[in-house]
C-alpha cells in the first residue's frame, strides 16, 4: 500500500514534467537559511498551484520566469495540461473524506481601480476554484479585515489573522492558504501520552506531550544522510513521513533533500516493529512569498517589470503581496483505535525485536498524498495542546 503511494507520488512541482529546478526543496532551503532556528512549514503543492494560477494572467518573460522557477520547462502545448492537472488535483484534494480535513484555496484581492480581464477571472474560477474580490486598499484596516475574514471562513476558523499588516499602496494581493487535519489510520492511545523532554538544542530543553505507539511502521535508516525515516499513514491516501537526523546532522539532511531522496526513501521503506515516540503538536508557517520567491528566480511579477496583461489592461500592475499560510495539527486521533493491549507501557525486555525511535530533537516532516502536501521542520513543537474533541 505504501508502494502504491510511492508510484503515484509527483514530488516535483506537482504535475511537473521535466524539472530543471527542484522547486519544493529549493524553496525549503531558502526558508531554512532565512530562519535557521525557526519552525518551517509550508505546502509546496499549494504554492505551486497559486503560482501556476498567476501564470494564467502573466505575459512573456513574467510567465516564463514563473514556470521556470517552478521547474517547468513547458512548451505552449503543455501549458493547458499543467492547468488541467491542477484543476483535477484541486478537485481531488477538496473532496470531503472521512477523518480528513483539508481546506486549500487561493484568492485574489484587487484594488477597486483594477479592471480584471473576464477571461482571467473565468479561468481562475474554472481551473483553480479561486475567487477574486474588489478591495479598497486605501482603507488598509478594512481591507485587512476583509482578507482575514475570508480566509478564516474558508478554513472554518483554523486560519485567522493571515495578514498582520497591510500596505495601503497595495494593488493586487494574492492569498494562498491550506489547513490539514486528518486521523491516523491507527490512533495513538491518549493514555500513552505524557510530558517528555524535547531538546531544541543540546542546551535548551522544553517539555512536550509525547505520544507513543508500538506498531509495525515503514522505516529506514539512511546512512548517507545520517537520519532515520518513519512513515505513519493517515486514513485515506496521505502519509506523514517523519525524519529524525542524527545529532548535529540536521543541516546535512536539509542539504540532501531532493525529489530523488524522497523517492529513494519511499522505495526503500521496510516494515519494522517500532516503539515510536512523537510529540503532539500544531505547527504553522506564514510566508510573504514576494520576499522569498525572487531567490528562486521568480521576481518580475512582484516588481514594476511585471507583465500581468492577462489579468488587467492596466499596464503598471504588479503583485504587491503573495501570502501563504499552512497549518497542521498532529495529535493522537485515529480512525482505528490503537491496539488496546498494554503495549504502550510494558517492559522493554519483553520486546527485544522492537526498536525505540524518539523524536525528542528537531526533525523534519512531510505529508504526502500523491503530491507533497506539506514539508516542514519542527525545531520547537508548538504548544497549543488543548485536548479539544473536534477530532
Amino acid at each position: 500500500e505504501m508502494k502504491k503511494r510511492v508510484e503515484d507520488l509527483h514530488v516535483g512541482a506537482t504535475v511537473a514534467p521535466s524539472s530543471r529546478r527542484d522547486f519544493t526543496f529549493d524553496l525549503y532551503r531558502v526558508l531554512a537559511s532565512a530562519a535557521p532556528s525557526q519552525n518551517i512549514f509550508f505546502s509546496p503543492v499549494s504554492i505551486s498551484m497559486s503560482l501556476a494560477m498567476l501564470s494564467l494572467g502573466a505575459g512573456s518573460s513574467t510567465k516564463m520566469q514563473i514556470l521556470e522557477g517552478l521547474g517547468l520547462n513547458l512548451q505552449k502545448s503543455s501549458e493547458e495540461e499543467l492547468h488541467r492537472g491542477f484543476q483535477q488535483l484541486l478537485q481531488e484534494l477538496n473532496q470531503p473524506r472521512d477523518g480528513f480535513q483539508l481546506s486549500l484555496g487561493n484568492a485574489l484581492f484587487t484594488d477597486l481601480v483594477v479592471d480584471l480581464q473576464d477571461t482571467f477571472v473565468s479561468a481562475m474560477k474554472t481551473l483553480y476554484l479561486a475567487d477574486t474580490f474588489p478591495t479598497n486598499f486605501r482603507d488598509s484596516a478594512g481591507a485587512m479585515k476583509q482578507i482575514n475574514d475570508y480566509v478564516a471562513k474558508q478554513t472554518k476558523g483554523k486560519i485567522v489573522d493571515l495578514l498582520k499588516n497591510l500596505d495601503s499602496n497595495a494593488v493586487v494581493i494574492m492569498v494562498n492558504y491550506i489547513f490539514f487535519k486528518a486521523k491516523w489510520e491507527t490512533s495513538f492511545n491518549h493514555k500513552g501520552t505524557q510530558e517528555q523532554d524535547f531538546y531544541v538544542t543540546s542546551e535548551t530543553v522544553v517539555r512536550v506531550p509525547m505520544m507513543s505507539r508500538e506498531d509495525q511502521y515503514h522505516y529506514l535508516l539512511d546512512r548517507n544522510l545520517s537520519c532515520r525515516v518513519v512513515g505513519v499513514p493517515y486514513q485515506g491516501n496521505a502519509t506523514a513521513l517523519f525524519i529524525l537526523p542524527s545529532e548535529g546532522k540536521m543541516q546535512q539532511v536539509e542539504n540532501g533533500l531532493s525529489e530523488k531522496t524522497l523517492r529513494k526513501w519511499l522505495k526503500m521503506f521496510k516494515k519494522r516493529q517500532l516503539e515510536l515516540y512523537l510529540p503532539k503538536f500544531s505547527i504553522e508557517g506564514s510566508y510573504q512569498l514576494e520576499k522569498v520567491l525572487p531567490s528562486l528566480g521568480i521576481s518580475n511579477v512582484f516588481t514594476s517589470h511585471a507583465d500581468l496583461s492577462g489579468i488587467s489592461n492596466h499596464s503598471n500592475i504588479q503583485v504587491s503581496e503573495m501570502v501563504h499560510k499552512a497549518v497542521v495539527e498532529v495529535d493522537e486521533s485515529g480512525t482505528r483505535a490503537a491496539a488496546a493491549t498494554g503495549t504502550i507501557f510494558t517492559f522493554r525486555s519483553a520486546r527485544l525485536n522492537s526498536q525505540r525511535l524518539v523524536f525528542n530533537r528537531p526533525f523534519l516532516m512531510f505529508i504526502v498524498d500523491n503530491n507533497i502536501l506539506f514539508l516542514g521542520k519542527v525545531n520547537r513543537p508548538g504548544s497549543d495542546y488543548k485536548d479539544d474533541d473536534d477530532k
Epitope: E195, R207, P209, M210, S212, F345, S349
Partner: antibody
Framework: EVQLQQSGAELVKPGASVKLSCTAS????????MHWVKQRPEQGLEWIGR????????KYDPNFQDRATITADTSSNTAYLQLTSLTSEDTAVYYC????????????WGQGTLVTVSA | QIVLTQSPAIMSASPGEKVTITCSAT?????MHWFQQKPGTSPKLWIY???NLASGVPARFSGSGSGTSYSLTISRMEAEDAATYYC?????????FGSGTKLEIK
Amino acid sequence: EVQLQQSGAELVKPGASVKLSCTASGFDIRDTFMHWVKQRPEQGLEWIGRIDLVNVNTKYDPNFQDRATITADTSSNTAYLQLTSLTSEDTAVYYCARGGYDVREFAYWGQGTLVTVSA
Amino acid sequence: QIVLTQSPAIMSASPGEKVTITCSATSSLIYMHWFQQKPGTSPKLWIYSTSNLASGVPARFSGSGSGTSYSLTISRMEAEDAATYYCQQRSSYPFTFGSGTKLEIK
C-alpha cells in the same frame, strides 16, 4: 516485578555529606529516568532532580543545584543522590522514583530513606 | 518556576459525600498529575495526565482541568480515601508539587 530498594537511614552531622542509593530490580536503569524527591517531617513533597539515563543528562531544582548530585552506576543498576553541606533543614525522607519513555513517570517509588542531620 | 496552589489545605468529608480538591498553577500546563500519600508510606501515583486513573484507583475518583486550573474529585467519599493528596506539574523544569490537601473522614 519492578522494585526500587533504597539504602538505610542515616544520621549525619551538620556540614557533612551523605550519599543515598536506590537499587532497581525488574528493569534496566539504562532505559529510564530516576527522580529524587524530598519530604521533610509533616511537610509536602519537593522534587530535587532527575537523571536521564537514556539521553545521559541531569536536571535539578535550582534550590538543590549547588548541593545535590545525582549519579548512576548501570553495572549495579543503582542510582545515587549525594547531598553536601547538610543542615537541619535537610532532615527528611528522600525518595527515588522511576520515569522513562515506556513507563508512567513516578508510577514506581522506593520506600524512602530517612536522613537525620543532628549534632 | 511554576507554583502550584492547592486548596483546601485540610478538609473533612462524610462517607458518601462529594469531595473536590483544586490546584491552580502560575503558568499554563500541559497536564496535571495527582498523588495520594498515607502516613508512613511512599506517595502513590493516583491520577496522571489530568484525567487518567492510575492502576488500581477506584472509579469514584476523577480528574479534570486545563490551562492553569485543575481538580481532583471523589464522587462519594469512603473511609479508605482519607489521605493527603498532592498535585504535581511536569510541564516545565523544575517539576513542582502543590503543598498538599489533607482529607479526613468525618
